[in-house]
Amino acid sequence: AGPAAAVLRELRCVCLQTTQGVHPKMISNLQVFAIGPQCSKVEVVASLKNGKEICLDPEAPFLKKVIQKILDGGNKEN
């Protein structure tokens, strides 16, 4: 995701609402924020190929698969 979400997330949660029905092929980059002292909510911000940043539902099945793959990959390397 672009810098805007990351900078904002330094201070507070960034996702007031999430966008449904985004095709994975439209996404150029994903940023997943775990909970922290400034926000007790898991948030996923997607940068789209058209330059927009949107928030996605962390519970979306395709996202959970992507995140699980990343986590599994990380565990194998450790």
Partner: antibody, heavy 118, light 109 residues
Framework: EVQLQQSGPELEKPGASVKISCKAS????????MNWVRQSNGKSLEWIGN????????SYNQKFQDKATLTVDKSSSTAYMQLKNLTSEDSAVYFC???????????WGQGTLVTVSA | QAVVTQESALTTSPGETVTLTCRSS?????????ANWVQEKPDHLFTGLIG???NRAPGVPARFSGSLIGDKAALTITGAQTEDEAIYFC????????FGGGTKLTVLQ
Amino acid sequence: EVQLQQSGPELEKPGASVKISCKASGYSFTVYGMNWVRQSNGKSLEWIGNFDPYFSVTSYNQKFQDKATLTVDKSSSTAYMQLKNLTSEDSAVYFCARGSWETIFAYWGQGTLVTVSA
Amino acid sequence: QAVVTQESALTTSPGETVTLTCRSSTGAVTTSNYANWVQEKPDHLFTGLIGGTNNRAPGVPARFSGSLIGDKAALTITGAQTEDEAIYFCALWYSNHVFGGGTKLTVLQ
């Protein structure tokens, strides 16, 4: 409506362990972290730690690192805190608290009184 | 560990503006301390009011506002009401959340 329902009061002997629960409803359980806080002598609050159910990650206040163990059961949307090797100093009311978009401690359970006495 | 200090008690009257403060033993409170304010009413009824210094929680009346005043975090109640009588705790983030001792606010009729 967000609700956090905690288990009932506990009376334990020194050296024992106790596990208290916090059943969440009215929201997507795995997306929000669950904090645990204790109130001793009816006044001061201490943050024990929190559990991130999405990534299954715990963060502890160092003071409670060897005292408390935080877990969750995602299937029942329930958070648990186990306290071990209890002493009289652990006698307190223990709370679970969930955040909102704006604040870490938005919604609180009703509290669970733990009394440690020989 | 850092110590967070609050006024032990304050008294105000309905309609008045009152400010509660939260001081850090480590120096000036900043936005990186993510000041939270929590209200406690009798029977262990806790409600989160403010997070991230100045973000009001859902359903909290607009008369409650959070800010930094000088080197402290502050909770201001503009036009206090009798139902605002409660204990108010602030919490500051260091490497964990540290709560102050609480301010007992009395709203005298």
